[in-house]
């Protein structure tokens, strides 16, 4: 049980990490200029990560991955026609 | 037959607000990416953004903040608003479906 | 800034001539998403290319593209008078969406 419940602990702790991890790299990319400041509403600001309130630190880094993710579909379908985003019409083209 | 109209176009006042709807027939856009691309007079495409089937849209950096995309589902149309116009707007802007099939494009001058 | 080249900005050719337009980037392209577009005055431009070298439907043999990473090609095999167009290249990145390369004029020499 120890075994299971360390285990547990470790992956989470794991996926902490990543998120840092993921932040840290977006933030240099804020840095360079480039990351960030693509994205959707009105609210989403484009401020690197250490300029934020540390509390918002997982959020914030959750909110880019789905950006990056939502991008890299996009990008897929439209210029690689990889991606079917297709919810009512699957296969039509 | 399968088609894109963009309209809403005019002359505007530097400054001034303008929304540019893209319409399809023949095709349901509900599950489609749109995309708004624009190209002023005599120059090259620029892309401005796109909205997924969920509604979130997505911009270019120069374009966050002054433009929004949006969709109507219920009416088969894509929305461009576009705010704060300068001079350097003017442009033809296009709606895309997938970047396979292109709407004619509609003429924006931004002009006092 | 992500800035895609194309070179030459104006093409002059014969029909018959085998031409090549090359689209470099200056960062990677995401997933070598590169496509190419061809562009007529008044019209809207009209997909060629998707995926670096999947030809589009219903477009002819005689364009082919090449690359990947940041440095992309464009061919026509046999120039036909249909041809006479602007070409542009787009690239995807994930971190600036898509962007257009400058556009290729091919001219009737």
């Known amino acids: 049980r120890r075994d299971v419940a360390h285990g547990i602990l470790n992956e989470a702790y794991r996926k902490v990490l990543d998120q840092l991890s993921a932040g840290k790299h977006l933030q240099s990319l804020v840095a360079r200029g480039v990351g960030g400041s693509l994205g959707g509403g009105a609210g989403d600001d484009a401020e690197p990560l250490s300029k934020r309130h540390s509390d918002g630190i997982f959020t914030d880094s959750y909110s880019r991955y789905r950006k990056q993710m939502a991008v890299k579909k996009y990008l897929a379908a439209v210029l690689g026609k990889r991606y079917k985003q297709r919810v009512k019409n699957k296969g039509r083209r | 037959e399968v088609q894109l109209v963009e309209s809403g176009g005019g002359l505007v006042q530097p400054g001034g607000s303008l929304r540019l709807s893209c319409a399809a027939s023949?095709?349901?856009?509900?599950?489609?990416?749109m995309t708004w691309v624009r190209q002023a007079p005599g120059k090259g495409l620029e892309w401005i953004g796109f909205i997924d089937a969920g509604g979130s849209a997505y911009y270019a950096t120069w374009a966050k903040g002054r433009f929004t995309i949006s969709r109507d589902n219920s009416k088969n149309t894509v929305y461009l608003q576009m705010n704060s116009l300068r001079a350097e707007d003017t442009a033809v802007y296009f709606c895309?479906?997938?970047?396979?099939?292109w709407g004619q494009g509609t003429l924006v001058t931004v002009s006092s | 800034d992500i800035v895609l080249t194309q070179s030459p900005s104006t093409l002059s050719a014969s029909v018959g001539d085998r031409v090549t337009i090359t689209c470099k980037s200056s960062e990677s392209v995401y997933g070598d998403y590169l496509a190419w577009f061809q562009q007529k005055p008044g019209k809207a431009p009209k997909q060629l290319i998707y995926d670096a070298s999947t030809l589009a439907s219903g477009v002819p043999s005689r364009f082919s593209g090449s690359g990947s990473g940041t440095e992309f090609t464009l061919t026509i095999s046999s120039l036909q008078p249909d041809d006479f167009a602007t070409y542009y290249c787009a690239g995807g990145y994930v971190s600036a969406g898509v962007a257009f390369g400058g556009g290729t004029k091919v001219e009737i020499k």
């Open positions: 895309a479906r997938d970047l396979d099939l």
């Open positions: 023949g095709i349901d856009l509900s599950s489609y990416y």
